[in-house]
């Protein structure tokens, strides 16, 4: 169990002087309004900070913004507002940072009402210089970079025009009118929904999904009667209005819309929704909302085609009103996901899956913890972790659960121990094995971040009072030491560290409590002298992931293989370093029936691992449709779980069945698909896709 804060952990000696020498204060010489921070590039140390200040006047709001740049991870900042001609920047568009290490930045300016178009400031040298460009349109959305080529930009106008630039925003061309939603696909493809009647908001379900592969020279309508569309991994999804026009069904394409399959998922009515919770090139987690304002639905996991789905979790919490779900991919361990269910008694309970949604179980409570008042049995309860739903309902939860791919097995989360999520003040819990076991690491709510690939965890208490203390741990949250980073406490607003958890620097943002004017201030602390030496081979130990029974030959097998990692010893206080690469040794497992999904037309009876044929397909909600026509489907009843690498062992062979089912979707068939050249009728409107804080791939 965790010794707690400042008990004799014996981890880091003389740390106060070391940290004091590496603590850098910067007071921003402007009034406290709002602040946004962006990292430009990876491992460049370049940070851009935009402060904006709105003065509420009776008739209008007067605003001013300042732009600051750091090239040493936030230790020093230079006011570069003059590079953007002291222009007021629109914060709702943020700073559009180019992909990878392109060094590109686009800032969208606030312009006066009568102007012909908007204005942007562009930089392609990591914000050392900016070029002002007047736009021939008023942007509705932030500029979208092509993932393949950062010179190619996409934007929607307030008039619902789709505009493309091929020279990093220097020149713009309107390639289509009446566009509701646009997204970059693979290889420079652009997908968008358009309504030739002109309205986006009123005619959802009557949109056309179009594609251009040549930046607007030609178009192909790949689907009609579209409600919405989304991209996830290799999959293109469209929710399509069915025959009666009141129900929608999901269609999936893996070839950019050339051909479509109808997903074997229940159709939904107008008050329901679909949401892709997670997707990669192998599979999809899809949430299907229950009818009525239930606040929950069912999670389905797909096969590798994205068409056949297995029921993964029922009563999955996903609010209809705010669109909150607690679904989280634990990135520090393969196959691990957590989320919440809405129990019959309306309590919210946390569950975890260690096998990519195959099975969901409660989280094991820390060994030494007592069950709280929500527990019926004071000895038997589980850990419940707070995520988006708790934050949305106003609980004292400052952060979502946190994990990083390069900090293997490490998970930090707010939680409580009982029968359900508690409304009481939460504590911070840490797992070092991907969610199998947990310790209570910190009392009360905190902000937290991971540095040096898990070598250091930094936390700051969540308080309404000004603060001046940070806590840090060099042993994955077991022991904590405190450091007073300033004599004068500040109102804390955020903790910033370079994305990717490889940095040794942490920036504490806040504003001063002042007799004069409250100002933005940042304190950047470099932990390089705490972890004085580079880690060596002796500092690492072998760890088998997903190990629950060392006696079992199959111990650690998840999705057909097990992985051994080299993990930093908790007692080692050393630097993993910026170039640290996770060392893992995979080994293939023998196949069992658990490595297979039931194919279309088959299901698993409860407590049985065998797939049996559905006795009667007719009348089921689930439809299966290949290419929009009646098809023969041949199946042996089993299909390997996407990403499963097992070999040998059980190889389920069943006689081949011929399943015949008429497709009832009025989805546009490929033979009806038509190409057309640029240009279409005018109109306006807007359609917003919802993207969740925890990167929900698509919510229709």
């Amino acid at each position: 169990s965790a010794p707690g804060e400042d008990e004799e952990c014996g981890r880091v000696r003389d740390f106060v002087a070391k940290l004091a020498n590496n603590t850098h204060q910067h007071v921003f010489d402007d009034l406290r309004g709002s602040v946004s921070l962006s990292w430009v590039g990876d491992s460049t140390g370049v940070i851009l900070v935009l402060t904006t200040f709105h003065v509420p006047l009776v008739i209008m709001t007067f605003g001013q913004s300042k732009l600051y740049r750091s090239e040493d991870y936030g230790k020093n900042f230079k006011d570069i507002t003059d590079l953007i001609n002291n222009t007021f920047i629109r914060t709702e568009f943020g700073m559009a940072i180019g992909p990878e290490n392109s060094g590109k930045v686009v800032l969208t300016a606030e312009v006066s009402g009568g102007s012909r178009g908007g204005r942007i400031f562009r930089s392609s040298d990591f914000a050392k210089n900016f070029v002002q460009t007047d736009l021939p349109f008023h942007p509705l959305t932030q500029m979208m970079y092509s993932p393949q080529n950062s010179d190619y930009l996409l934007a929607l106008s307030t008039e619902n025009g789709l505009w493309v630039s091929k020279n990093f925003g220097g020149k713009w061309e309107e390639i289509h009118k009446t566009v509701c939603l646009a997204k970059w696909g693979r290889k420079g493809t652009i997908f968008f929904t358009a309504n030739h009647n002109g309205s986006c908001s009123n005619d959802r379900g009557m949109l056309e999904l179009e594609r251009t592969t040549d930046y607007g020279k030609s178009f192909k309508t790949v689907a009609s009667k579209i409600y919405s569309f989304g991209l996830g991994g290799k999959f293109l999804f469209a929710s399509v209005m069915t025959g009666k026009g009141t129900l929608r069904a999901i269609h999936v394409s893996v070839d950019d819309g050339d051909t479509w399959n109808m997903a074997q998922l229940p159709p939904v009515g107008h008050e329901q929704f679909y949401s892709i919770l997670a997707a990669n090139d192998e599979m999809v987690f899809m949430h299907v909302d229950e009818p009525g304002d239930s606040g929950f639905g069912t999670i389905y996991v797909s096969d590798d085609r994205g068409t056949v789905y297995s029921k993964s979790l029922e009563r999955h919490l996903y609010t209809t009103t705010g669109g909150e779900t607690d679904f989280i991919n634990v990135t520090s361990l393969r196959g691990v996901f957590t989320t919440s269910i809405l129990a019959e008694d309306k309590s919210v309970q946390s569950v975890i899956s260690f096998d990519q949604g195959g099975e969901w179980v409660p989280l094991r409570k820390p060994a030494d913890s007592k069950c709280d008042a929500t527990a019926r049995d004071p000895e038997k309860c589980s850990l419940h972790i707070h995520a988006a739903y708790s934050i949305a309902t106003g609980l004292n939860v400052p952060m979502l659960p946190l994990s990083e791919p390069n900090a293997v097995g490490l998970v930090l989360a707010h939680g409580s121990v009982g029968d359900a999520i508690s409304v009481m003040r939460p504590d911070v819990y840490v797992s070092d094995d991907g969610g199998y076991t947990w310790i209570k690491a910190l009392e009360g709510p905190h902000y937290y971040t991971i540095l040096d690939s898990g070598g250091i965890i930094v936390a700051i208490e969540h308080s309404s009072r000004p603060i001046n203390v940070i806590k840090f741990s060099t042993d994955e949250g077991q022991c904590w030491q405190t450091y007073t980073f300033t004599r004068d406490p500040i109102y804390f607003t955020g903790l910033a560290s370079e994305p990717g958890a490889r940095s040794m620097n942490i920036s504490i943002w806040g504003f001063t409590e002042s007799f004069l004017t409250s100002q933005w201030v940042s304190y950047t602390i470099d932990f390089k002298d705490i972890l004085e030496r580079n880690c060596e081979e002796k500092d690492y130990t072998i760890w088998l992931a997903h190990s629950t029974d060392p006696e079992d030959y199959e111990d650690g097998c998840i999705l057909g293989y097990k992985e051994q990692f080299l993990r930093l010893r908790k007692s080692s206080v050393c630097q993993n370093g910026r170039d640290y690469v996770v060392t893992k040794q995979p080994s293939i497992c023998l196949c069992s029936l658990e490595d297979f999904l039931c194919d279309f037309g088959y299901y698993r009876p409860e407590n049985d691992s065998k797939c049996v044929e559905q006795p009667e397909l007719k009348g089921h909600d689930l439809e299966f449709c290949l290419y929009g026509r009646e098809e023969h489907l041949t199946t042996n009843g089993y299909r390997k779980i996407p990403g499963d690498k097992c070999q040998g062992g059980v190889n389920p062979v069943r006689e081949v069945k011929d399943l015949k089912k008429k497709c009832t979707s009025n989805f546009l068939s490929p033979e009806k698909q038509n190409s057309k050249s640029n240009g279409s009728a005018g109109g306006s409107g807007g359609l917003n896709d919802i993207f969740e804080a925890q990167k929900i791939e698509w919510h229709e």
Partner: antibody
Framework: EVHLVESGGDLVNPGGSLKLSCEAS????????MSWVRQTPDKRLEWVAM????????QYPDSVKGRFTISRDNAKNTLYLQMSGLKSEDTGTYHC??????????WGQGTLVTVSA | DVVMTQTPLTLSVTIGQPASISCKSS???????????LNWLLQRPGQSPKRLIY???KLDSGVPDRFTGSGSGTDFTLRISRVEAEDLGVYYC?????????FGAGTKLELK
């Protein structure tokens, strides 16, 4: 435009209490430190109390320490001065002032406090 | 407490002519942060005081550039290059470097 409007001034007996209010508008109240300054009948200006932007810190001159309490409600954009144990030398016009990079950047029109038997 | 001494107490001027007011503090007003918290205020007849100059020499917005502030340490001066009718009233200096904050007794600028 910055607007500060004081209220609550009155005629009060020595030893009595009074609470002054100052309603602020035209700026983001929670960002700025605030003060009360009084002007005595002989036109001298005297700083009376000061409060920091978030209301955490306060300062007073010895002449009012222990008798006056400055406070603020940032949600209501209002500054207060609670006065007790009032003396005749506390008589004057009490002005609410807003600070910026220095002190007393903006002044309200004032509210008259008279301490007399 | 820091005593602020203003001279003269009354200054009779002619419209269009220059004017100068002195303010001396009993201690240096240079703060540890490098700033000098010395303000000049003007109170026109029947009005509240209004700040003209802060941090020795910085003009508040809307203040005409005929006003200039100068000085350092303990000696400070407010100059008006050409007095106009709207400049008449009582001028106060005040310091904000040391607690308690203190004001000068005021200088009345009046017409000759």
């Amino acid at each position: 435009e910055v607007h500060l409007v004081e209220s609550g001034g009155d005629l009060v007996n020595p030893g009595g209490s009074l609470k002054l209010s100052c309603e602020a508008s035209g700026f983001i109240f929670s960002i700025y430190g605030m003060s009360w300054v009084r002007q005595t009948p002989d036109k001298r200006l005297e700083w009376v109390a000061m409060i920091s932007s978030g209301g955490i810190y306060t300062q007073y001159p010895d002449s009012v320490k222990g008798r006056f309490t400055i406070s603020r409600d940032n949600a209501k954009n209002t500054l207060y001065l609670q006065m007790s144990g009032l003396k005749s030398e506390d008589t004057g016009t009490y002005h609410c002032t807003r600070h910026d990079d220095s002190w007393f950047a903006y002044w309200g029109q004032g509210t008259l406090v008279t301490v007399s038997a | 407490d820091v005593v602020m001494t203003q001279t003269p107490l009354t200054l009779s001027v002619t419209i269009g002519q220059p004017a100068s007011i002195s303010c001396k503090s009993s201690q240096s007003l240079l703060d540890s942060n490098g700033k000098t918290y010395l303000n000049w205020l003007l109170q026109r007849p029947g009005q509240s005081p209004k700040r003209l100059i802060y941090l020795v020499s910085k003009l508040d917005s809307g203040v005409p550039d005929r006003f200039t502030g100068s000085g350092s340490g303990t000696d400070f001066t407010l100059r008006i290059s050409r007095v106009e009718a709207e400049d008449l009233g009582v001028y106060y200096c005040c310091q904000g470097t040391h607690f308690p904050l203190t004001f000068g007794a005021g200088t009345k600028l009046e017409l000759k």
